[in-house]
Protein backbone atom coordinates (compact mmCIF):
# COMPACT_ATOMS: atom_id res chain seq x y z
CA UNK A 1 0.00 0.00 0.00
CA UNK A 2 1.14 3.51 -0.84
CA UNK A 3 0.88 6.06 1.95
CA UNK A 4 -1.36 9.08 1.45
CA UNK A 5 -0.41 12.22 3.32
CA UNK A 6 -3.18 14.42 4.70
CA UNK A 7 -2.12 17.80 6.03
CA UNK A 8 -4.19 19.82 8.48
CA UNK A 9 -3.74 22.98 10.50
CA UNK A 10 -3.36 22.80 14.28
CA UNK A 11 -6.58 23.77 16.04
CA UNK A 12 -8.66 23.19 12.93
CA UNK A 13 -10.34 20.08 11.58
CA UNK A 14 -8.99 17.57 9.11
CA UNK A 15 -11.04 15.27 6.94
CA UNK A 16 -9.47 12.03 5.73
CA UNK A 17 -11.09 10.03 2.95
CA UNK A 18 -10.45 6.40 2.13
CA UNK A 19 -11.97 5.13 -1.12
CA UNK A 20 -12.68 1.41 -1.53
CA UNK A 21 -14.45 -1.10 -3.76
CA UNK A 22 -18.03 -1.06 -2.45
CA UNK A 23 -18.83 -4.49 -3.87
CA UNK A 24 -15.72 -6.18 -2.52
CA UNK A 25 -16.29 -4.74 0.97
CA UNK A 26 -20.10 -5.09 0.94
CA UNK A 27 -21.50 -5.76 4.42
CA UNK A 28 -18.21 -5.06 6.18
CA UNK A 29 -17.72 -2.61 9.01
CA UNK A 30 -14.77 -0.24 8.79
CA UNK A 31 -12.29 1.14 11.30
CA UNK A 32 -9.67 3.83 11.74
CA UNK A 33 -6.55 2.86 13.67
CA UNK A 34 -3.24 4.43 14.64
CA UNK A 35 -0.03 2.64 13.76
CA UNK A 36 2.16 2.14 16.85
CA UNK A 37 5.68 2.13 15.49
CA UNK A 38 6.82 0.92 12.10
CA UNK A 39 6.18 -2.75 12.81
CA UNK A 40 3.85 -2.37 15.79
CA UNK A 41 0.10 -3.06 15.96
CA UNK A 42 -2.55 -0.68 14.66
CA UNK A 43 -4.52 0.54 17.68
CA UNK A 44 -8.25 0.98 17.00
CA UNK A 45 -9.44 4.55 17.39
CA UNK A 46 -13.01 4.34 16.15
CA UNK A 47 -15.14 1.98 14.09
CA UNK A 48 -18.32 2.42 12.09
CA UNK A 49 -21.77 1.65 13.45
CA UNK A 50 -22.24 -1.92 14.61
CA UNK A 51 -25.26 -2.14 12.29
CA UNK A 52 -23.82 -2.00 8.77
CA UNK A 53 -27.07 -0.57 7.42
CA UNK A 54 -26.50 2.44 9.70
CA UNK A 55 -22.84 2.96 8.74
CA UNK A 56 -23.75 6.39 7.34
CA UNK A 57 -24.31 7.66 10.88
CA UNK A 58 -21.38 9.50 12.39
CA UNK A 59 -19.73 7.58 15.19
CA UNK A 60 -17.45 9.42 17.59
CA UNK A 61 -14.59 8.51 19.87
CA UNK A 62 -13.43 11.63 21.64
CA UNK A 63 -12.90 14.12 18.82
CA UNK A 64 -12.55 11.58 16.02
CA UNK A 65 -15.58 10.76 13.90
CA UNK A 66 -16.09 8.09 11.28
CA UNK A 67 -18.81 7.70 8.67
CA UNK A 68 -19.12 5.29 5.75
CA UNK A 69 -20.74 5.80 2.37
CA UNK A 70 -21.23 2.10 1.66
CA UNK A 71 -22.81 2.66 -1.77
CA UNK A 72 -20.23 5.14 -3.02
CA UNK A 73 -17.37 3.31 -1.35
CA UNK A 74 -15.83 6.12 0.68
CA UNK A 75 -14.89 6.00 4.34
CA UNK A 76 -14.54 9.45 5.90
CA UNK A 77 -12.70 10.20 9.13
CA UNK A 78 -12.88 13.61 10.76
CA UNK A 79 -10.19 14.75 13.19
CA UNK A 80 -11.45 17.73 15.16
CA UNK A 81 -9.26 20.33 16.85
CA UNK A 82 -6.10 18.87 15.33
CA UNK A 83 -3.08 18.88 17.65
CA UNK A 84 0.64 18.23 17.01
CA UNK A 85 0.43 14.89 18.86
CA UNK A 86 -2.11 13.70 16.29
CA UNK A 87 0.58 13.60 13.64
CA UNK A 88 1.50 10.06 12.68
CA UNK A 89 0.68 6.99 10.66
CA UNK A 90 -2.88 5.64 10.53
CA UNK A 91 -4.87 3.07 8.59
CA UNK A 92 -8.36 2.80 7.22
CA UNK A 93 -9.48 -0.80 7.64
CA UNK A 94 -12.24 -3.09 6.44
CA UNK A 95 -13.22 -5.64 9.08
CA UNK A 96 -14.28 -9.23 8.54
CA UNK A 97 -14.39 -11.52 11.54
CA UNK A 98 -11.22 -10.98 13.53
CA UNK A 99 -9.32 -9.97 10.38
CA UNK A 100 -8.80 -6.49 8.97
CA UNK A 101 -7.89 -5.47 5.43
CA UNK A 102 -6.03 -2.22 4.96
CA UNK A 103 -7.94 0.14 2.69
CA UNK A 104 -5.43 2.97 2.87
CA UNK A 105 -2.34 3.94 4.83
CA UNK A 106 -2.52 7.55 5.93
CA UNK A 107 0.15 9.88 7.24
CA UNK A 108 -1.36 12.79 9.15
CA UNK A 109 0.79 15.92 9.21
CA UNK A 110 -0.08 18.86 11.43
CA UNK A 111 0.88 22.30 10.16
CA UNK A 112 1.53 24.98 12.73
CA UNK A 113 0.67 27.98 10.57
CA UNK A 114 -1.57 28.05 7.49
CA UNK A 115 0.42 30.99 6.12
CA UNK A 116 3.40 28.67 5.73
CA UNK A 117 1.43 26.78 3.05
CA UNK A 118 -0.26 29.56 1.20
CA UNK A 119 -1.26 27.86 -2.02
CA UNK A 120 -4.96 28.72 -2.18
CA UNK A 121 -5.66 25.68 -4.30
CA UNK A 122 -4.22 23.43 -1.63
CA UNK A 123 -5.93 25.19 1.24
CA UNK A 124 -9.44 25.51 -0.09
CA UNK A 125 -9.75 22.66 -2.55
CA UNK A 126 -8.35 19.40 -1.14
CA UNK A 127 -6.34 17.66 -3.83
CA UNK A 128 -3.49 15.23 -4.36
CA UNK A 129 0.07 15.81 -5.49
CA UNK A 130 2.90 13.34 -5.90
CA UNK A 131 5.57 13.51 -3.23
CA UNK A 132 8.74 11.67 -2.30
CA UNK A 133 8.92 7.89 -2.70
CA UNK A 134 5.52 6.18 -2.45
CA UNK A 135 3.62 8.89 -0.60
CA UNK A 136 1.29 11.51 -1.99
CA UNK A 137 -0.13 14.52 -0.19
CA UNK A 138 -3.73 15.60 0.28
CA UNK A 139 -3.95 19.13 1.67
CA UNK A 140 -7.17 19.70 3.55
CA UNK A 141 -8.75 22.14 5.94
CA UNK A 142 -11.76 20.04 6.69
CA UNK A 143 -13.56 18.97 9.89
CA UNK A 144 -12.44 16.85 13.13
CA UNK A 145 -9.56 14.93 15.58
CA UNK A 146 -8.29 12.18 17.85
CA UNK A 147 -7.90 11.64 21.56
CA UNK A 148 -6.92 8.41 23.24
CA UNK A 149 -9.25 5.49 22.73
CA UNK A 150 -12.09 5.32 25.21
CA UNK A 151 -14.51 2.41 25.27
CA UNK A 152 -17.69 4.47 25.32
CA UNK A 153 -17.75 8.21 24.61
CA UNK A 154 -19.21 10.69 27.10
CA UNK A 155 -22.90 11.41 26.81
CA UNK A 156 -22.76 14.82 25.21
Amino acid sequence: HNTTVFQGVAGQSLQVSCPYDSMKHWGRRKAWCRQLGEKGPCQRVVSTHNLWLLSFLRRWNGSTAITDDTLGGTLTITLRNLQPHDAGLYQCQSLHGSEADTLRKVLVEVLADPLDHRDAGDLWFPGESESFEDAHVEHSISRSLLEGEIPFPPTS
Partner: antibody, heavy 118, light 112 residues
Framework: QVHLQQSGPEVVRPGVSVKISCKGS????????MHWVKQSHAKSLEWIGV????????SYNQKYKGKATVTVDKPSSTAYMELVRLTSEDSAIYYC???????????WGQGTTLTVSS | DVVMTQTPLTLSVTIGQPASISCKSS???????????LNWLLQRPGQSPKRLIY???YLDSGVPDRFTGSGSGTDFTLKISRVEADDLGVYYC?????????FGGGTKLEIK
Protein backbone atom coordinates in the same frame (compact mmCIF):
# COMPACT_ATOMS: atom_id res chain seq x y z
CA GLN B 1 -27.39 21.36 28.13
CA VAL B 2 -28.66 19.03 25.38
CA HIS B 3 -32.33 19.65 24.57
CA LEU B 4 -34.64 18.26 21.90
CA GLN B 5 -37.78 20.37 21.46
CA GLN B 6 -40.63 18.80 19.52
CA SER B 7 -43.64 20.46 17.91
CA GLY B 8 -47.01 20.46 19.64
CA PRO B 9 -49.89 17.97 19.58
CA GLU B 10 -51.75 17.32 16.34
CA VAL B 11 -55.37 16.32 15.78
CA VAL B 12 -56.02 15.41 12.15
CA ARG B 13 -58.52 13.65 9.91
CA PRO B 14 -57.83 10.24 8.38
CA GLY B 15 -56.14 10.30 4.98
CA VAL B 16 -54.17 13.53 5.49
CA SER B 17 -50.47 14.03 6.22
CA VAL B 18 -48.67 15.58 9.16
CA LYS B 19 -45.12 16.84 9.69
CA ILE B 20 -43.58 16.76 13.16
CA SER B 21 -40.44 18.73 14.03
CA CYS B 22 -37.60 18.23 16.50
CA LYS B 23 -35.16 21.05 17.17
CA GLY B 24 -31.81 20.18 18.76
CA SER B 25 -29.88 22.60 20.96
CA UNK B 26 -26.99 22.56 23.42
CA UNK B 27 -24.72 20.51 21.15
CA UNK B 28 -23.34 20.46 17.61
CA UNK B 29 -26.44 19.31 15.75
CA UNK B 30 -24.61 17.67 12.83
CA UNK B 31 -22.46 15.52 15.12
CA UNK B 32 -25.26 13.09 15.93
CA UNK B 33 -28.07 11.49 13.95
CA MET B 34 -31.72 11.67 14.94
CA HIS B 35 -34.02 8.69 15.50
CA TRP B 36 -37.80 8.61 15.53
CA VAL B 37 -39.74 6.27 17.81
CA LYS B 38 -43.48 5.58 18.04
CA GLN B 39 -45.20 4.83 21.34
CA SER B 40 -48.68 3.38 21.24
CA HIS B 41 -50.76 1.39 23.71
CA ALA B 42 -50.98 -1.52 21.29
CA LYS B 43 -47.30 -1.88 20.37
CA SER B 44 -45.28 -0.28 23.17
CA LEU B 45 -42.21 1.37 21.55
CA GLU B 46 -41.34 0.96 17.87
CA TRP B 47 -38.31 2.28 16.02
CA ILE B 48 -39.39 4.12 12.86
CA GLY B 49 -36.14 5.31 11.35
CA VAL B 50 -33.08 7.52 11.61
CA UNK B 51 -31.45 10.35 9.68
CA UNK B 52 -27.86 11.49 9.61
CA UNK B 53 -27.93 15.20 10.39
CA UNK B 54 -24.43 15.32 8.85
CA UNK B 55 -25.06 13.89 5.37
CA UNK B 56 -28.85 13.51 5.20
CA UNK B 57 -28.81 9.74 4.69
CA UNK B 58 -31.73 7.81 6.12
CA SER B 59 -32.70 4.31 7.16
CA TYR B 60 -36.17 3.03 8.00
CA ASN B 61 -37.84 0.14 9.70
CA GLN B 62 -39.36 -1.79 6.77
CA LYS B 63 -42.76 -1.47 8.44
CA TYR B 64 -42.66 2.34 8.11
CA LYS B 65 -41.30 2.64 4.57
CA GLY B 66 -43.90 4.61 2.63
CA LYS B 67 -45.53 5.77 5.86
CA ALA B 68 -42.78 7.95 7.33
CA THR B 69 -40.22 10.25 5.72
CA VAL B 70 -37.52 11.88 7.82
CA THR B 71 -35.65 14.98 6.73
CA VAL B 72 -33.29 17.51 8.25
CA ASP B 73 -32.73 21.26 8.00
CA LYS B 74 -29.18 21.92 9.13
CA PRO B 75 -29.34 25.74 9.36
CA SER B 76 -32.18 25.55 11.89
CA SER B 77 -30.82 22.39 13.62
CA THR B 78 -34.19 20.74 13.09
CA ALA B 79 -35.19 17.22 12.10
CA TYR B 80 -38.61 16.46 10.66
CA MET B 81 -40.80 13.41 10.23
CA GLU B 82 -43.72 13.41 7.82
CA LEU B 83 -46.41 10.76 8.17
CA VAL B 84 -48.74 10.23 5.22
CA ARG B 85 -52.16 8.65 4.58
CA LEU B 86 -52.97 8.73 8.26
CA THR B 87 -55.30 6.22 9.89
CA SER B 88 -56.40 5.67 13.47
CA GLU B 89 -53.51 3.19 13.82
CA ASP B 90 -51.11 6.11 13.52
CA SER B 91 -52.53 7.72 16.67
CA ALA B 92 -49.63 7.63 19.12
CA ILE B 93 -46.90 9.65 20.78
CA TYR B 94 -43.91 10.20 18.48
CA TYR B 95 -40.47 10.87 19.93
CA CYS B 96 -37.25 12.06 18.41
CA UNK B 97 -34.14 10.72 20.15
CA UNK B 98 -30.51 11.54 19.54
CA UNK B 99 -28.21 8.95 18.05
CA UNK B 100 -25.02 8.25 19.89
CA UNK B 101 -23.25 5.70 17.72
CA UNK B 102 -22.29 3.23 20.38
CA UNK B 103 -25.68 3.42 22.07
CA UNK B 104 -28.41 5.64 20.62
CA UNK B 105 -31.32 7.31 22.38
CA UNK B 106 -29.18 9.18 24.92
CA UNK B 107 -31.53 12.19 24.79
CA TRP B 108 -35.22 12.26 23.93
CA GLY B 109 -37.66 14.95 22.88
CA GLN B 110 -40.75 15.52 25.01
CA GLY B 111 -42.92 13.70 22.48
CA THR B 112 -45.59 14.82 20.03
CA THR B 113 -49.08 13.39 20.47
CA LEU B 114 -50.82 12.61 17.21
CA THR B 115 -54.56 11.92 17.21
CA VAL B 116 -56.16 10.73 13.99
CA SER B 117 -59.92 11.00 14.23
CA SER B 118 -62.86 11.65 11.96
CA ASP C 1 -37.28 -8.89 13.55
CA VAL C 2 -35.88 -9.82 16.96
CA VAL C 3 -38.65 -10.20 19.52
CA MET C 4 -37.94 -8.88 23.02
CA THR C 5 -40.07 -10.40 25.79
CA GLN C 6 -40.21 -8.83 29.23
CA THR C 7 -41.56 -10.35 32.43
CA PRO C 8 -43.40 -9.57 34.59
CA LEU C 9 -45.84 -7.13 33.00
CA THR C 10 -46.34 -5.39 36.34
CA LEU C 11 -44.19 -5.46 39.45
CA SER C 12 -45.49 -4.28 42.81
CA VAL C 13 -42.68 -3.63 45.29
CA THR C 14 -42.39 -2.20 48.78
CA ILE C 15 -39.98 0.69 49.23
CA GLY C 16 -36.58 -0.63 50.32
CA GLN C 17 -37.18 -4.10 48.87
CA PRO C 18 -35.39 -5.52 45.81
CA ALA C 19 -36.91 -5.84 42.35
CA SER C 20 -35.97 -7.89 39.31
CA ILE C 21 -37.10 -7.65 35.66
CA SER C 22 -36.36 -10.27 33.01
CA CYS C 23 -35.82 -9.63 29.31
CA LYS C 24 -35.44 -12.40 26.74
CA SER C 25 -34.60 -12.03 23.06
CA SER C 26 -35.57 -14.36 20.22
CA UNK C 27 -31.96 -14.32 18.93
CA UNK C 28 -28.57 -13.92 20.58
CA UNK C 29 -27.61 -10.28 21.09
CA UNK C 30 -23.87 -10.95 21.05
CA UNK C 31 -22.54 -8.96 18.12
CA UNK C 32 -19.62 -9.90 15.88
CA UNK C 33 -17.64 -7.06 17.50
CA UNK C 34 -17.85 -8.85 20.86
CA UNK C 35 -20.29 -6.38 22.37
CA UNK C 36 -23.85 -7.15 23.42
CA UNK C 37 -26.17 -4.30 22.48
CA LEU C 38 -28.83 -4.86 25.13
CA ASN C 39 -30.03 -1.70 26.83
CA TRP C 40 -32.63 -0.53 29.33
CA LEU C 41 -34.80 2.58 29.38
CA LEU C 42 -36.97 3.99 32.16
CA GLN C 43 -40.08 6.00 31.42
CA ARG C 44 -41.40 7.77 34.48
CA PRO C 45 -45.10 8.74 34.52
CA GLY C 46 -45.82 11.60 32.12
CA GLN C 47 -42.21 11.78 30.91
CA SER C 48 -40.15 10.73 27.91
CA PRO C 49 -38.08 7.55 28.13
CA LYS C 50 -34.60 7.94 29.61
CA ARG C 51 -31.55 5.80 28.99
CA LEU C 52 -30.74 3.79 32.11
CA ILE C 53 -28.31 0.99 31.26
CA TYR C 54 -26.44 0.28 28.05
CA UNK C 55 -24.41 -2.64 26.74
CA UNK C 56 -25.96 -4.96 29.35
CA UNK C 57 -24.34 -3.51 32.45
CA TYR C 58 -23.06 0.06 31.99
CA LEU C 59 -25.01 2.60 34.04
CA ASP C 60 -25.80 5.86 32.31
CA SER C 61 -24.51 9.00 33.99
CA GLY C 62 -26.54 9.92 37.06
CA VAL C 63 -28.04 6.46 37.47
CA PRO C 64 -27.59 5.23 41.07
CA ASP C 65 -25.65 2.03 41.65
CA ARG C 66 -28.75 0.44 43.17
CA PHE C 67 -29.39 -0.54 39.54
CA THR C 68 -27.49 -3.42 37.99
CA GLY C 69 -27.80 -5.03 34.59
CA SER C 70 -26.61 -8.54 33.79
CA GLY C 71 -27.01 -11.39 31.34
CA SER C 72 -25.71 -12.67 28.03
CA GLY C 73 -26.85 -14.22 24.79
CA THR C 74 -30.65 -14.15 24.98
CA ASP C 75 -31.35 -13.79 28.74
CA PHE C 76 -30.96 -10.51 30.58
CA THR C 77 -31.95 -9.09 33.95
CA LEU C 78 -32.34 -5.65 35.47
CA LYS C 79 -32.13 -5.57 39.26
CA ILE C 80 -32.80 -2.83 41.76
CA SER C 81 -31.25 -3.63 45.11
CA ARG C 82 -33.52 -1.35 47.16
CA VAL C 83 -36.47 0.26 45.43
CA GLU C 84 -37.09 3.97 46.03
CA ALA C 85 -40.18 6.05 45.23
CA ASP C 86 -38.32 7.70 42.32
CA ASP C 87 -37.95 4.31 40.59
CA LEU C 88 -41.60 3.91 39.65
CA GLY C 89 -42.39 3.90 35.96
CA VAL C 90 -42.17 1.58 32.99
CA TYR C 91 -38.89 -0.19 32.23
CA TYR C 92 -38.10 -1.21 28.66
CA CYS C 93 -35.31 -3.38 27.36
CA UNK C 94 -34.28 -2.93 23.72
CA UNK C 95 -31.70 -4.42 21.41
CA UNK C 96 -29.31 -2.75 18.97
CA UNK C 97 -27.49 -5.83 17.69
CA UNK C 98 -29.88 -6.65 14.86
CA UNK C 99 -31.64 -4.38 12.40
CA UNK C 100 -34.16 -2.93 13.09
CA UNK C 101 -33.96 -1.88 16.72
CA UNK C 102 -36.69 -3.60 18.74
CA PHE C 103 -38.10 -2.99 22.22
CA GLY C 104 -39.62 -5.13 24.91
CA GLY C 105 -43.26 -4.59 25.86
CA GLY C 106 -42.32 -2.88 29.11
CA THR C 107 -42.58 -3.72 32.82
CA LYS C 108 -44.53 -1.35 35.04
CA LEU C 109 -42.97 -0.91 38.47
CA GLU C 110 -45.51 0.09 41.08
CA ILE C 111 -44.87 1.02 44.67
CA LYS C 112 -46.90 -1.02 47.18
Amino acid sequence: QVHLQQSGPEVVRPGVSVKISCKGSGYTFTDYGMHWVKQSHAKSLEWIGVISTYNGNTSYNQKYKGKATVTVDKPSSTAYMELVRLTSEDSAIYYCARDFGYVPFDYWGQGTTLTVSS
Amino acid sequence: DVVMTQTPLTLSVTIGQPASISCKSSQSLLDSDGKTYLNWLLQRPGQSPKRLIYLVSYLDSGVPDRFTGSGSGTDFTLKISRVEADDLGVYYCWQGTHFPYTFGGGTKLEIK
